[in-house]
């Protein structure tokens, strides 16, 4: 028996469900009561799902993995995974037995989209050219971990005097600060880019000082 | 058996550069935030640094080393890189290659048995 | 930066009593604080991961607990391999990733 999988890792959003899929091509006269299946965790090799001795015998995973019982006799293994957390993510074999065996393993790769920046100015008021001031941008509920690229009004990247810090909530997504501290020209536009590097999804923020008011 | 092994330690005076390797086995390396932190001798533990998983490249380093150390990874050769520029003496220590147990949370499962290096003139 | 201060510097204790060892950080880090142990020469081994959940293959004799800012944990029989250098380490808020100073146990 061969098991075929994809090759490209699948991509699902937190809070989704998501399918891995794994395909084996059953002989003339195969019946379901021949079939091993088993998926696991490929590391851990901890069970997630298995159907033997002729029967699904459900989800070891949290309960929210499933088969798809009427497709199984036409060689479809595929698990669906309700539900998507953080910690879904990694490697997990499919193993199937009939015969001989065989296994091949797919990649889960969780991700949640940054909300749009929220940029605050510190101090945010009598700013004058020449000032020193902290602009911070912050972005939330995302995963996996974003990338922070700062910009002027001319788009020329500002690098110097940026700190980025990541904080990790309950549910393993991440909010994440980055803080350009910059002295005023005459007058300026401040961006900052926020990029969730698997959806290749940017999110933008900017502040624009022209003395008084400031525009967000 | 996950296995870490540290490797490309040795003497150097200040100023002068040496790459650390790890090499990791056991577990799907390309799934797995890597991590380097060092152990002054008689000293406690200090993270270093740290890379993203698969191949998005995202680092971060302790202050005392940015802009001198650069941590990179080769996922086809299950290889973890810290490219040490500029030493110092205050560098010296043991450093451990350490995987982060999960991508959102930090915390080190695994450790190397480190590779010492030593600054001095 | 996220401080974290572990109490007392040295333990003694006699081997088969209760070790009892503190970590406070200087914010909340909620549940996002693990525990090492590392014994001379050796590296850190993972003991306790989210302020609670024991490592793969740590005997049940250590146990963490704690939220917010103050941790404990807590050794219940000790065991001669047990004598050793312990570090907590939060992942809350990064970077840095943070260690305590570690509190040292020894034979009383």
């Known amino acids: 028996v061969e098991v075929q999988v994809s090759e490209d890792p699948v991509v699902a959003l937190v809070d989704t469900d998501a399918t891995l899929r794994c395909s084996f091509s059953p002989e003339p006269g195969f019946s379901l009561a021949q079939l091993n299946l088993i998926w696991q965790l490929t590391d851990t090799k901890q069970l997630v799902h298995s159907f033997t001795e002729g029967r699904d015998q459900g989800s070891a995973y949290s309960n929210r993995t499933a088969l798809f019982p009427d497709l199984l006799v036409q060689g479809n293994a595929s698990l669906r995974l309700q539900r998507v957390r953080v910690t879904d993510e990694g490697s997990y074999t499919c193993f199937v037995s009939i015969q001989d065996f065989d296994s091949a393993a797919v990649s889960l790769q969780v991700a949640a989209p940054y909300s749009k920046p929220s940029m605050t100015l510190e101090p945010n008021k009598d700013l004058r050219p020449g000032n020193m001031v902290t602009i911070t941008c912050s972005s939330y509920q995302g995963y996996p971990e974003a990338e922070v690229f700062w910009k002027d009004g001319q788009g020329v990247p500002l690098t110097g005097n940026v700190t980025t810090s990541q904080m990790a909530n309950e549910r393993g997504l991440f909010d994440v600060h980055s803080v350009l501290r910059v002295v005023l020209g005459a007058n300026g536009t401040y961006s900052c880019l926020v990029r969730n590097p698997v959806l290749q999804q940017d999110a933008h923020g900017s502040v624009t000082i022209t003395g008084q008011p400031l525009t967000f | 058996d996950v296995q870490l092994v540290e490797s490309g330690g040795g003497v150097v005076r200040p100023g002068e550069s040496l790459r650390l390797s790890c090499a990791a086995s056991?577990?799907?390396?390309?799934?797995?935030?890597m991590n380097w932190v060092r152990q002054a001798p008689g000293e406690g533990l200090e993270w270093v640094s740290r890379?993203?998983?698969?191949?998005?490249?995202?680092?971060y380093y302790a202050d005392s080393v940015k802009g001198r150390f650069t941590i990179s990874r080769d996922n086809s050769k299950n290889t973890l890189y810290l490219q040490m520029n500029s030493l110092r003496a205050e560098d010296t220590a043991v450093y451990y290659c350490?995987?982060?147990?999960?991508?959102?949370?930090?915390?080190?499962?695994?450790w190397g048995l480190g590779t010492l290096v030593t600054v001095s003139s | 930066e996220i401080v974290l201060t572990q109490s007392p510097g040295t333990l003694s204790v006699s081997p088969g009593e209760r070790a009892t060892l503190s970590c406070r950080a200087s914010?909340?880090?909620?549940?996002?604080l693990a525990w090492y142990q590392q014994r001379p020469g050796q590296a850190p081994r993972l003991l306790i991961y989210?302020?609670?959940s024991r490592a793969t293959g740590i005997p049940d004799r250590f146990s963490g607990s704690g939220s917010g800012t103050d941790f404990t944990l807590t050794i219940s029989r000790l065991e001669p391999e047990d004598f050793a250098v312990y570090y907590c380490?939060?992942?809350?808020?990064?970077?840095?990733?943070?260690f305590g100073g570690g509190t040292k146990v020894e034979i009383k």
């Open positions: 914010q909340s880090v909620n549940s996002k």
């Open positions: 350490a995987k982060s147990g999960s991508n959102s949370n930090n915390f080190f499962d695994y």
């Open positions: 989210d302020a609670s």
């Open positions: 056991g577990f799907t390396f390309s799934n797995y935030a």
């Open positions: 890379i993203n998983y698969k191949g998005y490249n995202i680092t």
């Open positions: 380490q939060q992942y809350k808020n990064w970077p840095p990733l943070t």
